[in-house]
């Protein structure tokens, strides 16, 4: 399948560097509740050979573990294949490499199919600027406002950042 969004001007390399998770959304609320499999936080990203590499922070036992994941390119420019708690079709929905990134994933784990969206920003002080865009993308793909969780500093594993 293919999503008709455009990849960032200048290519994926512009996504490299530090990011901060601002909001999550899902049609299965348990996935993004504390200790949910998709309540994870971006630390940094890099791109190589068209693939996206991400370091994410996962809360575990009161601490945060850094895990490296790779989302592999597909024939569609904004779509990637990611193995994390099953198979994910990962789509870059809106990208401004200097400011914010909105992605969503269709997750298949055993016989269950779920939808998860993620808003991340470069500068946390500007997070409010991009929440309307996130709400708009979520609504468009079938996620409602009450399915969005806006993260706080405590949620984000801020203490685990280098």
């Amino acid at each position: 399948q293919e999503g008709n969004h455009e990849e960032p001007q200048g290519g994926l390399e512009e996504l490299s560097g530090r990011w901060h998770s601002v909001a999550l959304a899902s049609n299965k609320s348990d996935l993004i509740k504390p200790w949910g499999h998709f309540r994870v936080f971006i630390h940094s990203m890099s791109a190589k050979d068209g693939n996206l590499h991400g370091d994410i922070l996962i809360p575990q036992d009161g601490q945060c573990e850094k895990v490296s994941l790779t989302a592999f390119k597909t024939a569609t420019s904004n779509k990637f294949d990611l193995e994390y708690w099953g198979h994910n079709d990962l789509y870059l929905a809106e990208v401004d490499p200097k400011s914010y990134l909105i992605l969503y994933m269709i997750n298949q784990y055993n016989d269950d199919t779920s939808l998860v969206a993620h808003l991340m920003v470069r500068d946390l002080s500007r997070q409010q600027d991009f929440l309307p865009a996130f709400e708009s993308v979520c609504e468009d793909i079938g996620l409602h406002k009450d399915q969005i969780v806006v993260l706080s500093d405590d949620d984000r594993c801020q203490g685990s950042r280098d």
């Epitope: 049609n27 269709i106 199919t113 779920s114 939808l115 079938g142």
Partner: nanobody, 124 residues
Framework: QVQLVESGGGLVQAGDSLRLSCAAS????????MNWFRQAPGKEREFVAA????????FYADSVKGRFTISRDNPKATVYLQMNSLVIEDTAVYFC?????????????????WGQGTQVIVSS
């Protein structure tokens, strides 16, 4: 729920084009992700294309990518499937489906309404 009625099917030759329509009535059309599926004789129903609620995003099965185009007109409560360069393997009954979200591409669980289907036959 919405009620869905497909039209536009028929018998065409390989290489020809066809445009399917699906008219919706009932609840607000723009609240739904819309999909086309198809079912060939003796085969399972398969995903063809989907379009997000506003029409901003479209999704296609690999087998139709570059040949088929899904679009929607929310004021008219209609979704379309433009099918170009048809091949014999496209022969099937084509179903319109409304879904709560885009997971309908991967799972029928998100589908809330189905149309009755329209037959497309591609001959050589």
């Amino acid at each position: 729920q919405v009620q869905l009625v497909e039209s536009g099917g028929g018998l065409v030759q390989a290489g020809d084009s066809l445009r399917l329509s699906c008219a919706a009535s009932g609840r607000s059309f723009s609240n739904y992700v819309m999909n086309w599926f198809r079912q060939a004789p003796g085969k399972e129903r398969e995903f063809v294309a989907a379009i997000s609620r506003s029409g901003r995003s479209t999704f296609y099965a690999d087998s139709v990518k570059g040949r088929f185009t899904i679009s929607r007109d929310n004021p008219k409560a209609t979704v379309y499937l433009q099918m170009n360069s048809l091949v014999i393997e496209d022969t099937a009954v084509y179903f319109c489906a409304a879904a709560s979200d885009i997971t309908s591409m991967r799972s029928l669980a998100a589908i809330t309404s189905w149309g009755q289907g329209t037959q497309v036959i591609v001959s050589s």
